[in-house]
């Protein structure tokens, strides 16, 4: 069984922060910026980054900080999946990955985080104020979604810090408790950012490992159908969404797609590009819990058909984990 972590991680591992400003100068504002944006620590983080080398290329990284095996990840843009957003990629731990243009490469970074590279020109090209959303589904306890976008003044090569969606409830007590520190930090951060405005941007090296601490308590799932429970979206930019998504690579894919609930993916028209990428083994994720793994910090492996964990495995999802956490 999972042991509760006393201090949940506020952010995913950041890319290396070496550059023109120097390590010491950059780390503090970066940490402060992350704190300012992620107060309340929802279950999902989203990080959007524009590549310094290719200005039309974006990298979206998303991670699930909650407990439970991930059943499905959906990445969309233009708003939350199922609420006006257009699906860019769907990643299933065992059935594979499906993506649509302008998504170039979707992949699992760890068993609880994914990355998606977008590139394009013209109608299919994302732009700086596009909203990107990631939805993580985990049976039987539900779905969580968060959204993020590049700040309008982002320099190429700088990534937007993990951004919780406004539809996720903030822990008001937690926010109030650290508000003084955050207020000071944010003011200091703005001061540093102003100073940094005309300096060359540092090159950030993406981290390939994602150790994550177990999460604290619960957050409301993002459900379009349960909109009454959540703060409505304030700003969703749609000006950069493509007119069509018909430029995906014409590869056939595994047959599992047909068995996905159609509402889970909001399938766009056109052929799909597939990659059956296995998930890399996790390094130090310790927040999963289920009936078969008694030691704190253990996560069930993604097993093959040889290990039947359900009494009635009539579908592919049945092999993903024990009953309490699929």
């Amino acid at each position: 069984m999972r042991t509760e972590a006393q201090v949940p991680a506020l952010q995913p591992p950041e890319p290396g922060l070496e550059g023109a400003m120097g390590h010491r100068t950059l780390v503090l504002p970066w940490v402060l910026l992350t704190l300012c944006v992620t107060a309340g620590t929802p279950e999902v983080w989203v990080q959007v980054r524009m590549e310094a080398t290719e200005l039309s290329s974006f990298t979206i990284r998303c991670g699930f900080l909650g407990s439970g095996s991930i059943s499905l990840v959906t990445v969309s843009w233009g708003g939350p999946n199922g609420a006006g957003g257009t699906t860019l990629a769907v990643l299933h731990p065992e059935r594979g990955i499906r993506q649509w243009a302008p998504a170039r490469q979707a992949r699992w970074e760890t068993q609880s985080s994914i990355s998606l590279i977008l590139e394009g020109s013209g109608a299919s090209s994302p732009c700086a104020n596009t909203t990107f959303c990631c939805k993580f589904a985990s049976f039987p306890e539900g779905s969580w979604e968060a959204c993020g976008s590049l700040p309008p003044s982002s320099d190429p090569g700088l990534s937007a810090p993990p951004t919780p969606a406004p539809i996720l409830r903030a822990d008001l007590a937690g926010i109030l408790g650290v508000s003084g520190v955050l207020l000071f930090g944010c003011v200091y951060l703005l001061h540093l950012l102003r100073r940094h405005k005309h300096r060359p941007a540092p090159r950030l090296q993406p981290s390939r490992t994602s150790p994550q601490a177990p999460r604290a308590r619960a957050w409301a799932p993002s459900q379009a159908s349960q909109a009454a429970l959540h703060v409505p979206y304030a700003t969703i930019n749609t000006s950069c969404r493509p007119a069509t998504l018909d430029t995906a690579h014409p590869h056939g894919g595994p047959s599992w797609w047909a068995s996905l609930p159609t509402h889970a993916a909001h399938r766009p028209q056109g052929p799909a590009a597939w990659a059956s990428t296995p998930i890399p083994a996790r390094g130090s994720f310790v927040s999963v819990e289920n009936g078969l793994y008694a030691q704190a910090g253990e996560r069930p492996p993604h097993t093959g058909p040889g290990l039947t964990l359900f009494p009635d495995p009539r579908g592919p999802r049945a092999m993903e984990g024990p009953l309490g956490v699929r």
Partner: antibody
Framework: EVKLVESGGGLVKPGGSLKVSCAAS????????MSWVRQTPDKRLEWVAC???????YYPDSVKGRFTISRDNGRNIVNLQMSSLRSEDAAMYYC?????????????WGQGTLVTVSA | ENVLTQFPAIMSVFLGERVTMSCRAS?????MYWYQQKSDASPKLWIY???NLAPGVPARFSGSGSGNSYSLTISSMEGEDAATYYC?????????FGGGTKLEIK
């Protein structure tokens, strides 16, 4: 409006079989996991079975091998076939709908159907 | 099996009084769910994901907790709150319920 109506309860002898059904309306039935929960005469609640949107099924050990949950998405019905019934299976059986496609927790409940197991 | 123990089993409180009932799990759980049941009625989802109120639940209700210990609180008891409250977990199989706390008006 979400509506769940159970039927099929009744008196059955120990070792006998019974099928209870739940007719659902007011929502897209195939989009939600469905469960059966029972309440014993001493008012204790016990989860009995769940079927998800992919028709994977889940049971506690206490009913595994004896109870079978199934769904008919065309007719918006979820069934619970019970066999080898024991006295401890006597209860009010509730049909419950999940919150969304991946959230099995019991967001909506029917009015229940009473199953009595007695010689 | 993760055994959920609710206490007290019965509470008698005055109207306007603050009420807190507890649910302890034999093993740590990720989230706790609470249901309200009035006599001769079906249970209703009351709190999900530990602290989120289901639609229609009055704001005087709140939920909290982590690990093995969870609680449901009513800031000011009202007559319509008299009912039995059950906690439940989905973290491990089988999904289990607590024995219930019956809340009565004194």
């Amino acid at each position: 409006e979400v509506k769940l109506v159970e039927s099929g309860g009744g008196l059955v002898k120990p070792g006998g079989s019974l099928k209870v059904s739940c007719a659902a309306s007011g929502f897209t039935f195939s989009d939600y996991p469905m469960s059966w929960v029972r309440q014993t005469p001493d008012k204790r609640l016990e989860w009995v079975a769940c079927i998800d949107t992919d028709e994977n099924t889940y049971y506690p050990d206490s009913v595994k091998g004896r109870f079978t949950i199934s769904r008919d998405n065309g007719r918006n019905i979820v069934n619970l076939q019970m066999s080898s019934l024991r006295s401890e299976d006597a209860a009010m059986y509730y049909c419950a709908r999940g919150w969304d496609d991946y959230a099995a927790w019991f967001a909506y409940w029917g009015q229940g159907t009473l199953v009595t197991v007695s010689a | 099996e993760n055994v959920l123990t609710q206490f007290p089993a019965i509470m008698s409180v005055f109207l306007g009084e603050r009420v807190t009932m507890s649910c302890r799990a034999s093993s740590s759980v990720n989230y706790m769910y609470w249901y309200q049941q009035k006599s001769d009625a079906s249970p209703k989802l009351w709190i999900y994901h530990t602290s989120n109120l289901a639609p229609g639940v009055p704001a005087r209700f709140s939920g909290s907790g982590s690990g093995n210990s969870y609680s449901l609180t009513i800031s000011s008891m009202e007559g319509e709150d008299a009912a039995t409250y059950y906690c439940q977990q989905f973290t491990s199989s089988p999904w289990t319920f607590g024995g219930g706390t019956k809340l009565e008006i004194k």
